[in-house]
């Protein structure tokens, strides 16, 4: 049936970037400006996404593919295809309903997005803490206490806090 239909249906010959125009005896017409068709055989073209406000254009719309948006500086994408933009916070913070709040003691966030997470529990793996955690950094686990030579100190103070500038995700 599928093969028979494709032989009889002139619309199946319309490539991506065109649509099968019922008003013109099913001739393949190019998609009008600001619209696209990403597959062949379509009877209409889809309207291009517009990246407005906090969204900015990452990839322009073409006759065969939709526009892609990302977020303006200070915001990051959320959801499939960057359906939302969410405010960035500083490292060591998380976004709450009341805005950006510092991570509580024992938690960290080394990115400008996402939540504060508990420091890794090194003892879970039989290790010890090699470098203390901060608001901006997880602990670094080291060898198990048994692996350390007597009198050796296991814990290193955290590296000075800096803004490593994570790429927006």
């Amino acid at each position: 049936f599928e093969r028979t239909r494709s032989l009889q249906d002139p619309c199946s010959n319309c490539p991506a970037g065109t649509f099968c125009d019922n008003n013109r005896n099913q001739i393949c017409s190019p998609c009008p400006p600001n619209s696209f068709s990403s597959a062949g055989g379509q009877r209409t073209c889809d309207i291009c996404r517009q990246c407005k406000g906090v969204f900015r254009t990452r990839k322009e719309c073409s006759s065969t593919s939709n526009a892609e948006c990302d977020c303006t500086p200070g915001f990051h994408c959320l959801g499939a295809g960057c359906s939302m933009c969410e405010q960035d916070c500083k490292q060591g913070q998380e976004l709450t309903k009341k805005g950006c709040k510092d991570c509580c003691f024992g938690t960290f966030n080394d990115q400008k997005r996402g939540i504060c997470r508990p420091w890794t529990n090194c003892s879970l793996d039989g290790k010890s803490v090699l470098v203390n955690g901060t608001k901006e950094r997880d602990v670094v686990c080291g060898p198990s206490p048994a692996d350390l030579s007597p009198g050796a100190s296991s814990v290193t103070p955290p590296a000075p806090a800096r803004e490593p500038g994570h790429s927006p995700q």
């Epitope: 080394d110 990115q111 996402g114 939540i115 997470r117 890794t120 529990n121 090194c122 879970l124 793996d125 290790k127 090699l130 470098v131 997880d138 602990v139 670094v140 686990c141 080291g142 590296a159 000075p160 800096r162 490593p164 500038g165 994570h166 790429s167 995700q169």
Partner: antibody, heavy 119, light 107 residues
Framework: QVQLVQSGAEVKKPGASVKVSCKAS????????INWVKQAPGQGLEWIGN????????NYNQKFKDKATITADKSTSTAYMELSSLRSEDTAVYYC????????????WGQGTTVTVSS | DIQMTQSPSSLSASVGDRVTITCRPS??????LNWYQQKPDKTVKLLIY???RLRSGVPSRFSGSGSGTDFTFTISSLQPEDIATYFC?????????FGQGTKLEIK
């Protein structure tokens, strides 16, 4: 014993998708980041992204954001990476790795999965 | 992204030689620098983490040093089983990046 076991080699046609799996055993799967790393033939290592299985929070290298989708199934202690719209340049060995008690280094590596894209 | 410049790209040395590999990130990464060994069979192993910390079970002939933007990996006395490619990797800033690798061969 603590290990990551990856799925077998795949041969795919351009435009297809592939889903590579990474089964963890011998440790608490939800407590460690799983990373995915690409090694193209004769090339170095490239970090694709990672996932924290406890809440499925992901990070991606911007370069792979439209190529890779990383997921995790807590019930089977398995992480997955799906690669879409395959092209010849996606031909590579893909490794899953586990962090060394924080996301900053990788103490455990899977054996690698070879993905070949060829028409 | 932070670029990791690793040198040399390949080297040939004799058993017992002291071998040194350098890694220079394009920006300060504090001490978040790790070294990996990839054997010819493609298996990968973490040798050194946080610049200088030797992973347990790794022979003491391997060592690392440095900070900021200049790091060194040393094998004090090369052994036949050390034939491999060695990679540095920064864990300071997303996306985490690797050096291009140093292929080590025995003379």
């Amino acid at each position: 014993q603590v290990q990551l076991v990856q799925s077998g080699a795949e041969v795919k046609k351009p435009g297809a998708s592939v889903k590579v799996s990474c089964k963890a055993s011998g440790y608490t799967f939800t407590s460690y980041w799983i990373n995915w790393v690409k090694q193209a033939p004769g090339q170095g290592l490239e970090w694709i992204g990672n996932i924290y299985p406890s809440d499925s929070y992901t990070n991606y290298n911007q370069k792979f954001k439209d190529k890779a989708t990383i997921t995790a199934d807590k019930s089977t202690s398995t992480a997955y990476m799906e690669l879409s719209s395959l092209r010849s340049e996606d031909t590579a060995v893909y490794y899953c790795t586990r962090d060394y008690g924080s996301a900053y280094s990788y103490s455990l590596w899977g054996q690698g999965t070879t993905v070949t894209v060829s028409s | 992204d932070i670029q990791m410049t690793q040198s040399p790209s390949s080297l040939s040395a004799s058993v017992g030689d002291r071998v040194t590999i350098t890694c220079r990130p394009s920006q300060d990464i504090s001490n978040y620098l790790n070294w990996y060994q990839q054997k010819p069979d493609k298996t990968v192993k973490l040798l050194i983490y946080y610049t200088s910390r030797l992973r347990s079970g790794v022979p003491s002939r391997f060592s690392g040093s440095g900070s900021g933007t200049d790091f060194t990996f040393t094998i004090s006395s090369l052994q036949p089983e050390d034939i491999a490619t060695y990679f540095c990797q920064q864990g300071d800033t997303l996306p985490y990046t690797f050096g291009q690798g140093t292929k080590l061969e025995i003379k």
